[in-house]
């Protein structure tokens, strides 16, 4: 439905508070280096303009598109060329090319300082002094570091952030109340950001059809009692929402997400029995709750899939007449019967089915040709099952830290060209699959593990895309979205890799390691492990374990010493010499 003024329409729909928050997120996600104050100024100007359009939709410039209005505003930033270099060239373009240009310059790994958490009293004072600025700053800092963060969900995080401070700054023990909440928000936020990044990568790199297929599979698992037509409607609407958010159209995205939540709650009887509690919550909580809702129970007595998709004489007729609808129905029917499968496995099965029909529906004997298609699914199902079983056994045997180390070694040997910080970050996250998923019963392990691994491997893909260094990573990342994990799993040691020159500086440690948190100390050790493997890719597990054990003992010893720095200097030299000897460097 056309509106005379798009900006007025969105302002009225969303309300001033959400409007301002979303514009701030949008601007911070585009101009990630700009100071907070500059963004606030731009947002205030846009908001004032929007109010004039609400008052009179025919006022000057009110008929302009949001991209035009926002792009024009961003292009007024004085330091654009100095701060962003070639991104400034976007401003010479017309819409829609200008917005596309801004999108292409979003940086998944911006050169920004790590967010250091101030003392609790300092934070509480800042919160009380100026609550609005304090919360805006949160939105700004998260948005600029996570340029694809799902904007309406970030509003939900901000609401929880505010609630945490409101409650805990009045508590007797502020820190005990606040810090766990902030840790939880941080961890959930990182996970949310990574999940959304995969959705955007799916849309941008593989197209709408790939995203829709993912959505059909996931929603069919979640709402197995819903009819195919209902699931299709939800998929269409959800695709629109995510296309908008991934495209920087955050006002439209938030508005459409609210409409979708409203529709789902109005039609919950025909969607899922699990929505009741979600639908009683306020908007932001409601949308979040729906997105995380547990799978509904499968309808009883679902017939065999073979009847419609193998045995029917109309398989090829139905497929040829509406390929995507027929494949969508197959995916829906398979997914609603298999909440125990990962979405990516379901998509692999659908792809196999599609490939078989493409072949067999042009064959002289189509039925004989596709009669055994379901037999082809068996190895596809068994591969992730076996992999998860093996890795969960390894996780249970080693614990998270050592399991991460095993993965660090494995992945460094596969793709040693990748930067050490990226290998550490990705392998640590891959390793978290153990504590996240191995505790689940068999029926929940695969959807938990493999779909989580898809999210983590996407992080590797987007970081690698920024600075490509490995053809193998590029190949696994670009050939097939659903086969990324099997592609990486299948990689063996890269025999073409020329070992890195030994540099003693890489293995020189100082007393500051003693004051680091356990997590930071692990990262230091894991960084050293990656560097070791890069120097000696053919080192055995036993050799690496011996060196790492010596290293752990060395850190522990020197951190207990009276003169820590001297200990690190002297014992460090000995450790490096011993390690070189042990590894034959």
């Amino acid at each position: 439905d056309a509106h005379k003024s798009e900006v007025a329409h969105r302002f009225k729909d969303l309300g001033e508070e959400n409007f301002k928050a979303l514009v701030l997120i949008a601007f911070a996600q585009y101009l990630q280096q700009c100071p907070f104050e500059d963004h606030v100024k731009l947002v205030n100007e846009v908001t004032e303009f929007a109010k004039t359009c609400v008052a009179d939709e025919s006022a000057e410039n009110c008929d302009k598109s949001l991209h035009t209005l926002f792009g024009d505003k961003l292009c007024t930033v004085a330091t654009l060329r100095e701060t962003y270099g070639e991104m400034a060239d976007c401003c010479a373009k017309q819409e829609p090319e200008r917005n596309e240009c801004f999108l292409q310059h979003k940086d998944d790994n911006p050169n920004l300082p790590r967010l250091v958490r101030p003392e609790v009293d300092v934070m509480c004072t800042a919160f009380h002094d100026n609550e609005e600025t304090f919360l805006k700053k949160y939105l700004y800092e998260i948005a600029r570091r996570h340029p694809y963060f799902y904007a309406p969900e970030l509003l939900f995080f901000a609401k929880r952030y505010k609630a945490a401070f409101t409650e805990c700054c009045q508590a007797a023990d502020k820190a005990a109340c606040l810090l766990p909440k902030l840790d939880e928000l941080r961890d959930e936020g990182k996970a949310s950001s990574a999940k959304q990044r995969l959705k955007c990568a799916s849309l941008q790199k593989f197209g709408e059809r790939a995203f829709k297929a993912w959505a059909v599979a996931r929603l069919s698992q979640r709402f197995p009692k819903a009819e195919f037509a209902e699931v299709s409607k939800l998929v269409t609407d959800l695709t629109k929402v995510h296309t908008e958010c991934c495209h920087g159209d955050l006002l439209e995205c938030a508005d459409d997400r609210a409409d979708l939540a409203k529709y789902i709650c109005e039609n919950q009887d025909s969607i899922s029995s699990k929505l009741k509690e979600c639908c009683e919550k306020p908007l932001l909580e409601k949308s979040h709750c729906i997105a995380e809702v547990e799978n509904d129970e499968m309808p009883a007595d679902l017939p065999s899939l073979a009847a419609d998709f193998v045995e029917s004489k109309d398989v090829c007729k139905n497929y040829a007449e509406a390929k995507d609808v027929f494949l969508g129905m197959f995916l829906y029917e398979y997914a609603r019967r298999h909440p125990d499968y990962s979405v990516v496995l379901l998509l692999r099965l659908a792809k196999t089915y599609e490939t078989t029909l493409e072949k067999c529906c042009a064959a002289a004997d189509p039925h004989e040709c596709y009669a055994k298609v379901f037999d082809e699914f068996k190895p596809l199902v068994e591969e992730p099952q076996n992999l998860i079983k093996q890795n969960c056994e390894l996780f249970e045997q080693l614990g998270e830290y050592k399991f991460q180390n095993a993965l660090l070694v494995r992945y460094t040997k596969k793709v040693p060209q990748v930067s050490t910080p990226t290998l550490v970050e990705v392998s640590r996250n891959l390793g978290k699959v153990g504590s996240k998923c191995c505790k689940h019963p068999e029926a929940k392990r695969m959807p938990c593990a493999e779909d989580y691994l898809s999210v983590v491997l996407n992080q590797l893909c987007v970081l690698h895309e920024k600075t490509p260094v490995s053809d193998r990573v590029t190949k696994c990342c670009t050939e097939s979205l659903v086969n990324r994990r099997p592609c990486f799993s299948a990689l063996e040691v890269d025999e073409t890799y020329v070992p890195k020159e030994f540099n003693a500086e890489t293995f020189t440690f100082h007393a500051d390691i003693c004051t680091l948190s356990e997590k930071e100390r692990q990262i230091k050790k894991q960084t050293a492990l990656v560097e070791l493997v890069k120097h000696k890719p053919k080192a055995t597990k036993e050799q690496l374990k011996a060196v790492m054990d010596d290293f752990a003992a060395f850190v522990e010893k020197c951190c207990k010493a009276d003169d820590k720095e001297t200990c690190f200097a002297e014992e460090g030299k000995k450790l490096v010499a011993a390690s070189q000897a042990a590894l034959g460097l």
Partner: antibody
């Protein structure tokens, strides 16, 4: 653009064998059935069989089992048909044709004339 | 195997005249395709999946039918339509062709 280029005319002795080729270009050769069709002078069309180069699967018209052997090579994107124990009845034009969904043949080669004569 | 009987075997039509030829199957088929062949050349796909016109085929041509009875119709004959037309069934192995209808210009 899609092209199917067949090998030249053949004149062979009865009892011998011949292998004719069909070089495909302009499309994903592995993903389409290649069919072979026989046409005798002044007569209709007769389907011999087909191959799916992606995995080598074949279907034959029962009348040509033992007479025709269809193969394909993915690297020069070429399909072949070998005809054995040739008689004058095998003298005909043989045409390769790409098969598509629901079994129609959308592109045809120019035909290879086979003459079996002593 | 399914036998396809085309009729008439030969027919002639004047320019502007409506032309209909039929293809009867010995048992039900899923889809029928039609090919045009002019002397000295390979056949060309003309109508496929019973009723769809192949690329470049004039809209005066149409195809219809189901089960065992199919037809090709030319709304208004033109000189360039003179050729032999073959039907071909899909859905039963082996694939089979009709003997052809030769359409001549009167």
């Amino acid at each position: 653009q899609v092209q199917l280029q067949q090998s030249g005319a053949e004149l062979v002795r009865p009892g011998s064998s011949v292998k004719i080729s069909c070089k495909a270009s302009g499309y994903a050769f592995s993903n389409y059935w290649m069919n072979w069709v026989k046409q005798r002078p002044g007569q209709g069309l007769e389907w011999i069989g087909q191959i799916y180069p992606g995995d080598g699967d074949t279907y034959y018209n029962g009348r040509f089992k033992g007479k025709a052997t269809i193969t394909a090579d993915k690297s020069p994107t070429t399909a072949y048909m070998q005809l054995s124990s040739l008689t004058s009845e095998d003298s005909a034009v043989y045409v390769c044709a790409r098969g598509v969904i629901l079994g129609s043949f959308d592109y045809w080669g120019q035909g290879t004339t086979l003459t079996v004569s002593s | 195997q399914i036998v396809l009987t085309q009729s008439p075997a030969i027919m002639s039509a004047s320019p502007g005249e409506k032309v209909t030829m039929t293809c009867s199957a010995s048992s039900s088929v899923s889809y029928m395709h039609w090919y045009q062949q002019k002397s000295g050349t390979s056949p060309k796909r003309w109508i496929y999946d019973t009723s769809k016109l192949a690329s470049g085929v004039p809209v005066r041509f149409s195809g219809s039918g189901s089960g065992t009875s199919y037809s090709l119709t030319i709304r208004s004959m033109e000189a360039e339509d003179a050729a032999t037309y073959y039907c071909q069934q899909w859905g039963s192995n082996p694939l089979t062709f009709g003997a052809g209808t030769k359409l001549e210009l009167k």
